[in-house]
């Protein structure tokens, strides 16, 4: 979902960290949504 940045070597070198960060933020968002849902 970030096609243009793939031309930058930095993107390649940080890819694993980027994926981890995105997975983590998705988990946090899902947990936040669950908390909100549970409180309704």
């Amino acid at each position: 979902d970030n096609p243009s940045l793939s031309i930058d070597l930095t993107f390649h070198l940080l890819r694993t960290l980027l994926e981890l960060a995105r997975t983590q933020s998705q988990r946090e968002r899902a947990e936040q949504n669950r908390i909100i849902f549970d409180s309704v």
Epitope: N2, S4, L5, I7, D8, L9, T10, F11, H12, L13, L14, L17, L18, A21, R22
Partner: antibody, heavy 118, light 112 residues
Framework: QVQLVQSGAEVKKPGASVKVSCKAS????????MKWVRQAPGQGLEWMGV????????FYNQKFKGRVTMTVDKSISTAYMELSRLRSDDTAVYYC???????????WGQGTLVTVSS | DVVMTQSPLSLPVTLGQPASISCRSG???????????LEWYQQRPGQSPRLLIY???NRFSGVPDRFSGSGSGTDFTLKISRVEAEDLGVYYC?????????FGGGTKVEIK
Amino acid sequence: QVQLVQSGAEVKKPGASVKVSCKASGYTFTDYFMKWVRQAPGQGLEWMGVINPNQGDIFYNQKFKGRVTMTVDKSISTAYMELSRLRSDDTAVYYCARGTDRALFAYWGQGTLVTVSS
Amino acid sequence: DVVMTQSPLSLPVTLGQPASISCRSGQSIVHSDGNTYLEWYQQRPGQSPRLLIYKVSNRFSGVPDRFSGSGSGTDFTLKISRVEAEDLGVYYCFQGSHIPWTFGGGTKVEIK
């Protein structure tokens, strides 16, 4: 041609914050990560962190985590680096830099001298 | 963190003669993709750093062919075949294979 133009020199008191800007031109700003490197007087180079201007992903050198904030304003192709709780040993020239598909620091700004003194 | 150790700290040279700078990494800097992201930068007095070499031995565009890089694993070298006056300054090696990215302490090339 690729150009990175930084803001002017700053003098700050210990405990204050400083925000350095880096205006990019000559390429599509969102196509390349922006890095920040600093150099204390007479010392070597130290990588501070990197920001993805497209999606805002940021990776900081742990040494600066909690004191440094990197942001971008895509509308004016400008990256910012803010360093808080300044100490005298933060006196340094701060550089922004951009890579290519082959190397990490191919293009550099002219540097911004930040002096921390009481 | 990967410590990058350069030697010598200072390198007095005679113009027209060769010069060699060594850079050793505290651990292997071969990336998981098989590449070695070892770069060399030149910093002339009062100027911003300038990229010379990337991935150990590749000259960046506009860099004169008197500059060459070599090495593997943990041992790397930057060579200047014939030093010119414009080559005086500080040279830094850098590794981008492991986070945090780290620079060597620098080698100052000066007139003997």
